[in-house]
Amino acid sequence: MAVTACQGLGFVVSLIGIAGIIAATCMDQWSTQDLYNNPVTAVFNYQGLWRSCVRESSGFTECRGYFTLLGLPAMLQAVRALMIVGIVLGAIGLLVSIFALKCIRIGSMEDSAKANMTLTSGIMFIVSGLCAIAGVSVFANMLVTNFWMSTANMYTGMGGMVQTVQTRYTFGAALFVGWVAGGLTLIGGVMMCIACRGLAPEETNYKAVSYHASGHSVAYKPGGFKASTGFGSNTKNKKIYDGGARTEDEVQSYPSKHDYV
């Protein structure tokens, strides 16, 4: 039960995280015009990974896409790549984890397969989260560097009296969305990996024992006991819900060890 909850929660947290990463990647507010200690303008500038926008006090907003690939800063390209890799890995991870969910039965998929899939999706979520955090952090670092550079040259004197106010940019909402989303995806991935450990069927020395009554081919298994013999390496621990008789064939079934209450 705890494993199912951990896996389910990990999936939901990762789902929210990846939705957040997608939202952050699409958002225009990666960097916003710094208003502190600046003359008040009727125009507000903000920029995203894909376009830059200008919002005027009148309410008119104009956005322009970056219609060049080669002309863009390498750092911006790197951030774009990291975010896209994060989304792709996260999406694949979600797809894999849906089939890995314990609460979903798909054919006769074994627990070992589900455990592997859970681990795979967990690792994917972790890498996805790290990509998003890295992408956002690289962009934030770029902003900080540019901010202090533009602060140093904030007022460039032109002929003494005339001044040019350089637009400084600070952290936009998308950065915080990206950090939180990356963190959630990472946490979801860790939860999936923890759930995987609980899902993995462990080979133990405890086997079901068959008591053969003379002249009868019936196996008597007292309920609630885990007896063992050294034989039948394929047999797995089986909860006996009633103390009734079972056939020998039934001893060869493969229920999960988590069916124990």
Partner: antibody, heavy 118, light 113 residues
């Protein structure tokens, strides 16, 4: 068509208050910003204040403490409340509409004269 | 506040001749985000309210004759009347539409020589 009609001007004593109105038609105040601009006799234009479509306001810092701009969207009317009036506030007061993109005043009223005199 | 300085204060030009008015702002009116200059030009005839001629430093308002043109960027702007007509006699104002408070130049009076 777009029309702006100012009213409320007149002769007022120094230190008193006056409220100017600007009736807007042909557009909605929820879609456009509207300005007050004044012009003292024989002088140039002086920007007073603006109320934007969303209700935000900006003022000429020299007048901010005494003048208040507001609007009533349902009545399509812009107001300028002027307190502690001085002789130097004597001017023709115009209201003008913002054009929307690139911030310029595309339609102007005929103006209302305010004379501050004892 | 941003100071807008127009030159000359008055200008006398013959009919059909070119009239040029300059406007200088104390800070750049060019917005880096969209590479637009937030400067407008107005014409005011005696006893009338101002009329918008040019916005965005160079875009002519609809209905304005094409003899009026605006140019310049950053801090230096120019209004040009390519062929002065009798009806162009007026006072012309430039206006900062970028920094609050929006400020006007002192005006340039255009007359016929």
């Amino acid at each position: 068509q777009v029309q702006l009609v100012e009213s409320g001007g007149g002769v007022v004593q120094p230190g008193r208050s006056l409220r100017l109105s600007c009736a807007a038609s042909g557009f909605t105040l929820t879609s456009y910003g509207v300005y007050w601009v004044r012009q003292a006799p024989g002088k140039g234009l002086e920007w007073v204040a603006v109320v934007w479509a969303g209700g935000n306001t900006n003022y000429n810092s020299a007048l901010m403490s005494r003048f208040t701009i507001s609007k009533d969207n349902s009545k399509s009317t812009l107001y300028l409340q002027m307190n502690s009036l001085r002789a130097e506030d004597t001017a023709v007061y115009y209201c003008a509409r913002d054009r929307g993109r690139l911030l310029a005043m595309d339609y102007w009223g005929q103006g209302t004269l305010v004379t501050v005199s004892s | 506040d941003i100071v807008m300085t127009q030159s000359p204060d008055s200008l006398a030009v013959s009919l059909g001749e070119r009239a040029t008015i300059n406007c200088k702002s104390s800070q750049s009116l060019l917005n880096s985000g969209n590479q637009k200059n937030y400067l407008a030009w107005y014409q005011q005839k005696p006893g009338q309210p101002p009329k918008l001629l040019i916005y965005g430093a160079s875009t002519r308002e609809s209905g304005v004759p094409d003899r009026f043109s605006g140019s310049g960027s950053g801090t230096d702007f120019t209004l040009t009347i390519s062929s002065l007509q009798a009806e162009d006699v007026a006072v012309y104002y430039c206006q900062n539409d970028y920094f609050f408070p929006f400020t006007f130049g002192q005006g340039t009076k255009v007359e016929i020589k």
